[in-house]
Interface confidence: low
Amino acid sequence: TTPEPCELDDEDFRCVCNFSEPQPDWSEAFQCVSAVEVEIHAGGLNLEPFLKRVDADADPRQYADTVKALRVRRLTVGAAQVPAQLLVGALRVLAYSRLKELTLEDLKITGTMPPLPLEATGLALSSLRLRNVSWATGRSWLAELQQWLKPGLKVLSIAQAHSPAFSCEQVRAFPALTSLDLSDNPGLGERGLMAALCPHKFPAIQNLALRNTGMETPTGVCAALAAAGVQPHSLDLSHNSLRATVNPSAPRCMWSSALNSLNLSFAGLEQVPKGLPAKLRVLDLSCNRLNRAPQPDELPEVDNLTLDGNPFLVPGTALPHEGSMNSGVVPAC
């Protein structure tokens, strides 16, 4: 017997659907109506035929009362080829829901998104997370998606993007966005970061995550932030292969005084990098390759310094290098 595609937990909180059949019975998803957290994985299916069965242009207000009654707060949709028209139809209906966090992953969006009709209401999301989503419209995808959202978005996460740079002139400001996560875009690099951080479009950013994004030096990141007018309170540069030295010909960059927390863990650092902010509340240098304790003059003025998992803290550990057998156990790394 084939397993049921949808599973609802005992508390009616989380419902997960995995539609792997070539012609799935989508009505199975109705058992998720009582769930707060819903995940729908479509097994890589092309949802184009769906357009023939639904009227994507129908007035969604007819569904408003039904949709308002749904408990869903978090929705994840993954593994499908989705016509933009169908995505828009879903967003128009969900605008009447109490949905707060939408995650789209492993999707291929085909076609262009039509403009928001005058009478339509945007989706009041707090958090939008995209992972491995490709858009037929290239660099203008964010601007097209943004018009279907209300301006109150607080958290935006874009990972494994096929086009992490945006068409800045088309993007409107995100006035409420406090957290931007561009992690897991290894091809981004510092030049790409400059293109992605559209100047003055992210005025409220407090948290910026750039894990595994091909960043090379903290100074290069500083320059990109300064160019965009982005002044985060916390910056995560972990899981990048950072160089400790700065190009002598590169201009010195003044970090924003707003920055108080910097994560440089898992960055392959053999010494404390040059060009760090002069003062920080939190500096995380854990799980690097520091073979001696940093000298006070190498470090910023810092209240909370983390150095766990560096070779100098583990007796008898040599610096790991190609072909060496490193017998020392580095904690938590």
Partner: nanobody
């Protein structure tokens, strides 16, 4: 750790009033929504009133009788309940949707209080 602490519940006669308070404590960058839910014996938890980005949302059964308000400086949300009816008897739960909490600044998070009992006698 983000926590919600409700207060103000109790026993009241039909037609009376109560004011519930819910204080949020912990490291928070941004409270997105705050609201009140209730659960009567043998029934599911239902939304009573919610404040979302400044807009209010009420259940039809309490419209005109209950008022939700928020003090941002104190990270507290209130529920003023007037003209109470026996069918309002329930455990009232405070709910907050947070971003930038101490758990992770990149995660939307839903937090619930322990609940406060409201009993309306006829």
């Amino acid at each position: 750790q983000v926590q919600l602490q409700e207060s103000g519940g109790g026993l009241v006669q039909s037609g009376g009033s109560l004011r519930l308070s819910c204080a949020v404590s912990g490291s928070i960058f941004s409270i997105v929504d705050m609201g009140w839910y209730r659960q009567a014996p043998g029934k599911g938890r239902e939304l009573v009133a919610e404040l979302s980005d400044g807009a209010t949302n009420y259940a039809d059964s309490v419209l005109g009788r209950f008022t939700i308000s928020r003090d941002n400086a104190k990270n507290t949300v209130y529920l003023q309940m007037n003209s109470l009816k026996p069918e309002d008897t329930a455990v009232y739960y405070c709910n907050a949707d947070l971003t930038g909490s101490s758990y992770s600044p990149y995660r939307y998070l839903e937090v619930w209080g322990q609940g406060t009992q409201v009993t309306v006698s006829s």
